[in-house]
């Protein structure tokens, strides 16, 4: 025998108080699948959260974070404070990157400047708190009589040492 509730579509629930007829979800609730015996309460995006997508009878609301914060976790379960470029979030709030490190985003940690000399190159543009150094040609390439065009260095994936 087929369950009469299986005929109730998304956006409704099977109302046991009314002979199992399909009733629409009440305001501020939803059912995303058919055959539901209850509707779920819509998520409310308040405080540090703001509404990215309104709740409908068939889908929950979706939140993101208010300005000055960014989402953490699936479905934006929490919000983390933004910092300025050139800073990182510490236990005591946003702090400037130490000398020799940079952060070009509003989140994440300060990372060390690239060490150009490891690739046999010279520093073309100095690093700042917000920007990495720019490496230029190797010192040998700048010596008198050296060719002005140098072949590109072989591409290397981050985290992989050269073969």
């Amino acid at each position: 025998l087929q369950d009469p509730c299986s005929n109730c579509p998304a956006g409704t629930f099977c109302d046991n108080n009314r002979n199992q007829i399909c009733s629409p979800c009440p305001p501020n609730s939803f059912s995303s699948a058919g055959g539901q015996r209850t509707c779920d309460i819509c998520r409310q995006c308040k405080g540090v959260f703001r509404t990215r997508k309104e709740c409908s009878s068939t889908s929950n609301a979706e939140c993101d974070c208010t300005p000055g914060f960014h989402c953490l976790g699936a479905g934006c379960s929490m919000c983390e404070q933004d910092c300025k470029q050139g800073q990182e979030l510490t236990k005591k709030g946003c702090k400037d990157c130490c000398f020799g490190t940079f952060n070009d985003q509003k989140r994440g940690i300060c990372r060390p400047w690239t060490n150009c000399s490891l690739d046999g190159k010279s520093v073309l543009v100095n690093g700042t708190k917000e920007r990495d150094v720019v490496c230029g040609p190797s010192p040998a390439d700048l010596s008198p009589g050296a060719s002005s065009v140098t072949p590109p260095a072989p591409a290397r994936e981050p985290g992989h040492s050269p073969q």
Epitope: R43, Q44, K46, G47, V48, F49, F69, L72, G73, S77, M78, C79, E80, Q81, L89, T90, K91, K92, G93
Partner: nanobody, 128 residues
Framework: EVQLVESGGGLVQPGGSLRLSCAAS????????MGWVRQAPGKGREFVSA????????YYADSVKGRFTISRDNSKNTLYLQMNSLRAEDTAVYYC?????????????????????WGQGTQVTVSS
């Protein structure tokens, strides 16, 4: 047994200051995000402020921004709310709340369903 015990409430004149404390026990305090929530007579709950487990991220409701400061001392398992320039509309019962999740060391939440534990509250009355 988990306990959150608020203290520091009382009667204060408009423009005055109070410092609320919330002493926590029975759980790993530093891995929990914490929040202060208030409820005025006949009104709904309002999230006043929240702080991440490490203390790096802080949130303030617009109504208290620039006047209230949230902080925590993980070595003392205590949450604080420094309230300055108090107004009559700050009169309410103030509750502290603790919630744990994958990102609670770094993030904050103002969703009441996130918080696992709630204190009994402390009354703050601002009146001349």
């Amino acid at each position: 047994e988990v306990q959150l015990v608020e203290s520091g409430g009382g009667l204060v004149q408009p423009g005055g200051s109070l410092r609320l404390s919330c002493a926590a026990s029975g759980f790993t305090f530093s891995s929990y995000a914490m929040g202060w929530v208030r409820q005025a007579p006949g009104k709904g709950r309002e999230f006043v402020s929240a702080i991440s487990g490490y203390g790096g991220s802080t949130y303030y409701a617009d109504s208290v921004k620039g006047r209230f400061t949230i902080s925590r001392d993980n070595s003392k398992n205590t949450l604080y709310l420094q309230m300055n320039s108090l107004r009559a509309e700050d009169t309410a019962v103030y509750y502290c709340a603790a919630g744990s999740g994958l990102y609670s060391s770094y993030g904050v939440s103002t969703d009441p369903s996130f918080y696992d534990y709630w204190g009994q509250g402390t009354q703050v009355t601002v009146s001349s």
